[in-house]
Interface confidence: low
Amino acid sequence: LPAQVAFTPYAPEPGSTCRLREYYDQTAQMCCSKCSPGQHAKVFCTKTSDTVCDSCEDSTYTQLWNWVPECLSCGSRCSSDQVETQACTREQNRICTCRPGWYCALSKQEGCRLCAPLRKCRPGFGVARPGTETSDVVCKPCAPGTFSNTTSSTDICRPHQICNVVAIPGNASMDAVCTSTSPTRSMAPGAVHLPQPVSTRSQHTQPTPEPSTAPSTSFLLPMGPSPPAEGSTGDFALPVGLIVGVTALGLLIIGVVNCVIMTQVKKKPLCLQREAKVPHLPADKARGTQGPEQQHLLITAPSSSSSSLESSASALDRRAPTRNQPQAPGVEASGAGEARASTGSSDSSPGGHGTQVNVTCIVNVCSSSDHSSQCSSQASSTMGDTDSSPSESPKDEQVPFSKEECAFRSQLETPETLLGSTEEKPLPLGVPDAGMKPS
């Protein structure tokens, strides 16, 4: 005779387990039916009666066969910066994902807990790494010979047009302006856009070469006269020679004058000094800054004032995005304990017209015994953007999300706690602050 099929509830054979979609009730000591997804156990089984299941109440769910006394609550409604990709039903939780132009700053097992707007690179900066569903845009200064004149989360640095005769030299935020003859480009013209509906599979290309550590001048001359455009005539050698000559002479005079002044003022052998003019800060912001004579400029302890955004976040969900800790403006604590000077100004309060800050960095390098020859001077002045947000180091770090750290820029933060830093290189000379604007 075939073995009789046992109907729930039944006492299992010694050493055997209950069947699929059944559970062992310790009280009744019987195998009882589980409730199907979308239901929960209203009445637990006894020796004589099976589990009584009931449908989940509104806004609750169970995704698995279960014997829970209450269904799980669906997550709260998706926020305005999110899209509901899966609705709350009796069998599934709501899933919220970030809408286009935003990325997930704090993910959870399914969907996103917190979205943040993709950073926009301001003029003079291009996209080094595009944003994805889970990472922000990384901006970088445009290298010599390239520029970006837009505030965008997709535009990369584009090459300057190459002129036969330069009317206005290009810089990091402006293309070269040519005189009336037709220009040529080292690459295809037009703004280069990265794909905007960001995807986790987007390629992290490096569209432009990394900026060199060599100082870049604010007047970029063409490498040499390019051959005249086909069909055009005229002798360009003379004006180009004049421009080059006059510029070189001017530079030489400035350099000589500068070194003479320095030798008169300082009277130091082998002048190799760096001066950083730090903008006047209120007392509370100036704490921790040290004199310009020190080798390590501006060192402060990292701020630990930011509150935990969600202390109840599970260990699985505590994946923080690649952002740095909020610290005193202009300071970045690095792993090796060294400091990086920054010219980033702090954000202005929402709706306000924050103070603009001029930061000038003058670097003098003299390497001769009589202190007057072989001198070069470099000055770069940047106007701090009143609404620039903290800049991002291109390094892709995973920062643990503790109570002392802020995973993203939220409205809980005051502008004063936000960090500004240029790059992972110790003060690239002549490179303005790596300013980014939030969307």
Epitope: D58, C74, R77, A87
Partner: antibody, heavy 121, light 110 residues
Framework: QEQLKESGGRLVTPGTPLTLTCTAS????????VSWVRQAPGKGLEWIGI?????SIYYATWAKGLFTISRTSTTVDLKATSLTTEDTATYFC?????????????????WGQGTLVTVSS | AYDMTQTPASVEVAVGGTVTIKCQAS??????LSWYQQKSGQPPKLLIY???TLASGVPSRFSGSGSGTEFTLTISGVECDDAATYYC????????????FGGGTEVVVK
């Protein structure tokens, strides 16, 4: 006595936009889910969409882009963007029993008498 | 997604007889199913919700059963007044569905 009343149904030519309005009496419409259902002559019931008390809206897959549901504090509107002859039907405004699911309701417990929309050239 | 199929499309029943109408969901809808009665020239009227709960004022000769994907409406001791078209409707989700309603079953009372 709780009642629902639809208005705005009329004879229109194809391509004409039309707005139907649902008004409640005896209860506050704003605390309930409100669905629009239509019925072509001699055919079955066809669900168009629902607006929840919190303002979220769900449409039938075929109705997306063809109809827009909106609400004020006292009425719920159904706007048809560009009607065709196939949209000729009686349009019912229906109350969904309060439930706080984002995507559903328990039952449609109160129906209006319906308003006839005829689309003909 | 969540298509509702009603059978039969039409049924004839004698007064005092019993009629059974079936409704099948293409996916599980737990017990979130309602039944409506619609008489000619009138709007539909709620009979049963949550598969088996009788709406107020509905005679006890109407009963509903089922869970998951298979549901049944039974009218016992059919009266002349029961001649109507009956619709099932899933109340499980309104997300990404074509129609909440089944195609309807016409009940003709002889």
């Amino acid at each position: 006595q709780e009642q629902l009343k639809e208005s705005g149904g009329r004879l229109v030519t194809p391509g004409t936009p039309l707005t139907l309005t649902c008004t409640a009496s005896g209860f506050s419409l704003s605390s309930y889910y409100v669905s629009w259902v239509r019925q072509a002559p001699g055919k079955g019931l066809e669900w168009i969409g629902i607006i929840h008390s919190d303002g979220s809206i769900y449409y039938a897959t075929w109705a997306k882009g063809l109809f827009t549901i909106s609400r004020t504090s006292t009425t719920v509107d159904l706007k048809a963007t560009s009607l065709t002859t196939e949209d000729t039907a009686t349009y019912f405004c229906v109350r969904g029993y309060p439930g706080y699911y984002t995507s559903t309701f328990n039952r449609l417990d109160l129906w209006g008498q319906g308003t006839l929309v005829t689309v003909s050239s | 997604a969540y298509d509702m199929t009603q059978t039969p499309a039409s049924v004839e029943v004698a007064v005092g007889g019993t009629v059974t109408i079936k409704c099948q969901a293409s996916q599980t809808i737990s017990n979130e199913l309602s039944w409506y009665q619609q008489k000619s020239g009138q709007p539909p009227k709620l009979l049963i919700y949550r598969a088996s709960t009788l709406a107020s004022g509905v005679p006890s000769r109407f009963s509903g059963s089922g869970s998951g994907t298979e549901f049944t409406l039974t009218i016992s001791g059919v009266e002349c007044d029961d001649a109507a078209t009956y619709y099932c409707q899933q109340g499980y989700t309104t997300n990404n569905v074509d129609n909440l309603f089944g195609g309807g079953t016409e009940v003709v009372v002889k």
